[in-house]
């Protein structure tokens, strides 16, 4: 009872429980390797609690250390397809502000059709995360095959 | 101030720290693609704090957003074996109640012998998670090669 | 009773928010399969808040359940290279104290050049985690390709 009462003074976001899980909306136009994401309960099981989307890219609203995770599966893919179209690479990084631009996580598909990874990284309010998929294969838009999320872990 | 005081009355589980890490017990009978899990300190480093096992499947006891993670390694496997037996696919989903049935996470092995991934997803009390392995290869029961877990992240 | 009250006065580490993210420093001498890690803001985006490094290996300072994650990418690697040099295997385990020695997480590269995984595991103060890479290929030292971290989740 008192636990619940205590929470009443502060919304969850003020406890630092920022979290988001996104599903793929679309890929960019040619020459734009970025993946464009969407999230919200109307779309299924994706959500944003704290972070926001800015033109399909995830913007951080609270300073802290975050767990960033991603899975991307290539559409209509076999190991032969994947090796033939090598290098197909996914990179997650801070793309703005430009002064903080850096690659956080990078994976190549080689002979596989799915990459999945996660890492802890400090992020600051206003950081925008971009996910760049280079290569000539399309990512699957199935929500159980391609997703991207962050979870605030500590200040 | 009141948040910290409130914590004094309540056990850990009431803080929403539900967490479980499971090891493979056995595969299902033919035509049942589900993996059957087990957990508890007597078994090694697996445990359940909050969630429960129901006939080898993981049942959630607290509403919230969870980080779900899994690694499955195929037994006596080489890249040749894996490609020869393609498609071997692992899917994690809510299998009951039927009204909430959905695939949360899906991966194919292609030419690899291990898949590993993780994602954030909302789960509700009573949701049962099933892990379906389709194909003709056996999963390794080594506890450092095959495991499945959830961690409550926020309400 | 006093723990909750004490939290009001104490720094973050006392809340159990131990966390570390490390980057590869170097490989061991011949016959030593261990990877040697480094961390700290001067090195980039790696950090240690609670855990410490002991001769390049990660030592835990607080009992609890931890999320352990790792990604290792092989240097100058193609799927041909990876399959040719199979088995190349990464294992994360408790290497000291000897009485608690155990493998926690194990992955082979097969035809891929990157492995990435994560798991929940109980760790105790004083546990040292080692990451052993067996095989004849070098791990990439790029900070977005090879990293290792832990996050305290609950007591």
């Amino acid at each position: 009872q008192r636990f619940a009462q205590a929470q009443q003074q502060l919304p969850l976001e003020s406890l630092g429980w920022d979290v988001a899980e996104l599903q793929l909306n679309h890929t960019g136009p040619q020459q734009d390797p970025r993946l464009y994401w969407q999230g919200g309960p109307a779309l299924g099981r994706s959500f944003l609690h704290g972070p926001e989307l800015d033109k399909g890219q995830l913007r951080i609203h609270r300073d802290g250390i975050y767990m960033v995770h991603i899975q991307v599966t290539l559409a209509i893919c076999s190991s032969t397809t994947a090796s033939r179209h090598h290098p197909t690479t996914l990179a997650v990084g801070i793309c703005s502000p430009a002064s903080r631009s850096i690659s956080l996580l990078r994976l190549s598909f080689h002979q596989g059709c799915t990459i999945a990874s996660q890492r802890l990284t400090p992020l600051a309010r206003g950081d925008t995360l971009c996910t760049n998929l280079t290569g000539t294969l399309l990512p699957s838009r199935n929500t159980d095959e391609t997703f991207f999320g962050v979870q605030w872990v500590r200040p | 101030q009141r948040f910290a005081q409130a914590q004094q009355q309540l056990p850990l589980e009431s803080l929403g720290w539900d967490v479980a890490e499971l090891q493979l017990n056995h595969t299902g009978p033919q035509q049942d693609p589900r993996l059957y899990w087990q957990g508890g300190p007597a078994l090694g480093r697996s445990f359940l704090h909050g969630p429960e096992l129901d006939k080898g499947q993981l049942r959630i006891h607290r509403d919230g957003i969870y980080m779900v993670h899994i690694q499955v390694t195929l037994a006596i496997c080489s890249s040749t074996t894996a490609s020869r037996h393609h498609p071997t696919t692992l899917a994690v989903g809510i299998c009951s109640p039927a009204s909430r049935s959905i695939s949360l996470l899906r991966l194919s092995f292609h030419q690899g012998c291990t898949i590993a991934s993780q994602r954030l997803t909302p789960l509700a009390r009573g949701d049962t998670l099933c892990t379906n392995l389709t194909g003709t290869l056996l999963p390794s029961r080594n506890t450092d090669e095959t495991f499945f877990g959830v961690q409550w992240v926020r309400p | 009773q006093r723990f909750a009250q004490a939290q009001q006065q104490l720094p973050l580490e006392s809340l159990g928010w131990d966390v570390a993210e490390l980057q590869l420093n170097h490989t061991g001498p011949q016959q030593d399969p261990r990877l040697y890690w480094q961390g700290g803001p001067a090195l980039g985006r790696s950090f240690l808040h609670g855990p410490e490094l002991d001769k390049g290996q990660l030592r835990i300072h607080r009992d609890g359940i931890y999320m352990v994650h790792i990604q290792v990418t092989l240097a100058i690697c193609s799927s041909t290279t990876a399959s040719r040099h199979h088995p190349t295997t990464l294992a994360v385990g408790i290497c000291s104290p000897a009485s608690r020695s155990i493998s926690l997480l194990r992955l082979s590269f097969h035809q891929g050049c990157t492995i990435a995984s994560q798991r929940l595991t109980p760790l105790a103060r004083g546990d040292t985690l080692c990451t052993n890479l067996t095989g004849t290929l070098l791990p990439s030292r790029n900070t977005d390709e090879t990293f290792f971290g832990v996050q305290w989740v609950r007591p």
């Epitope: - | - | 590869l24 011949q30 990418t73 240097a75 100058i76 041909t80 040719r84 040099h85 004849t136 290929l137 070098l138 990439s140 030292r141 790029n142 900070t143 390709e145």
Partner: antibody, heavy 120, light 111 residues
Framework: EVQLVQSGAEVKKPGSSVKVSCKAS????????MHWVRQAPGQGLEWMGA????????SYNQNFKGRVTLTADKSTSTAYMELSSLRSEDTAVYYC?????????????WGQGTLVTVSS | DIVMTQSPDSLAVSLGERATINCRAS??????????MHWYQQKPGQPPKLLIY???NLESGVPDRFSGSGSGTDFTLTISSLQAEDVAVYYC?????????FGQGTKLEIK
């Protein structure tokens, strides 16, 4: 410690072929690329190619335009380099070489060298 | 192919003095956080001997007066105090990609 022992010196006519052997001690033969490097008299070092004995896969320097063939016999831990259509400028010392630990193309272990003289 | 260019072609240094040999690659030989540049010593009638690998790692058994440095395209082999037995030809070599290539060699003599 790995030792690489090569076959003896050869004198060959232009247009003929030569086959040089390299026997490796130790049990790591299948796990490391075996490289071949040549050195013409008073000249520098030139990489010719490599074979991965475990699978028989090869990589060649395109400068040799298909004249080099690398093979390996796992049962005897022996690698072979055959050079065809010999000409006078192929007169050189031919070395086999490999790495000691990491299987990248830098060379800890070298054979003693085999002098091949091409002369009419 | 990556072209490796050593300078100077020959070098005469007094015993006990420092000797420096440079090697420039026609493109970067760095990848994955390493510089794939190596140095060898060759004496007459002998195969080359590995001194330095991955730009700055001293091979086991090599005296610590030998050291390597550099990254990207420019690398240096340094002998801090020349000894009589160091008279030889020195080669740089990259292994960033196939084919690996060697520098033309630098002949080191005693002044």
């Amino acid at each position: 410690e790995v030792q690489l022992v090569q076959s003896g010196a050869e004198v060959k006519k232009p247009g003929s072929s030569v086959k040089v052997s390299c026997k490796a001690s130790g049990d790591t033969f299948p796990r490391y690329n075996m490289h071949w490097v040549r050195q013409a008299p008073g000249q520098g070092l030139e990489w010719m190619g490599a074979i991965f004995p475990g699978t028989g896969e090869t990589s060649y320097n395109q400068n040799f335009k298909g004249r080099v063939t690398l093979t390996a016999d796992k049962s005897t831990s022996t690698a072979y380099m055959e050079l065809s259509s010999l000409r006078s400028e192929d007169t050189a010392v031919y070395y086999c070489a490999r790495n000691s630990y990491y299987d990248y193309a830098w060379f800890t272990y070298w054979g003693q060298g085999t002098l091949v003289t091409v002369s009419s | 192919d990556i072209v490796m260019t050593q300078s100077p072609d020959s070098l005469a240094v007094s015993l006990g003095e420092r000797a420096t040999i440079n090697c420039r690659a026609s493109k970067s030989v760095s990848s994955s956080g390493y510089s794939f540049m190596h140095w060898y010593q060759q004496k007459p009638g002998q195969p080359p001997k590995l001194l330095i690998y991955l730009a700055d790692n001293l091979e086991s058994g090599v005296p610590d007066r030998f050291s390597g440095s550099g990254s990207g395209t420019d690398f240096t082999l340094t002998i801090s105090s020349l000894q009589a037995e160091d008279v030889a030809v020195y080669y740089c070599q990259h292994s960033r990609e196939f084919p690996p290539t060697f520098g033309q060699g630098t002949k080191l003599e005693i002044k």
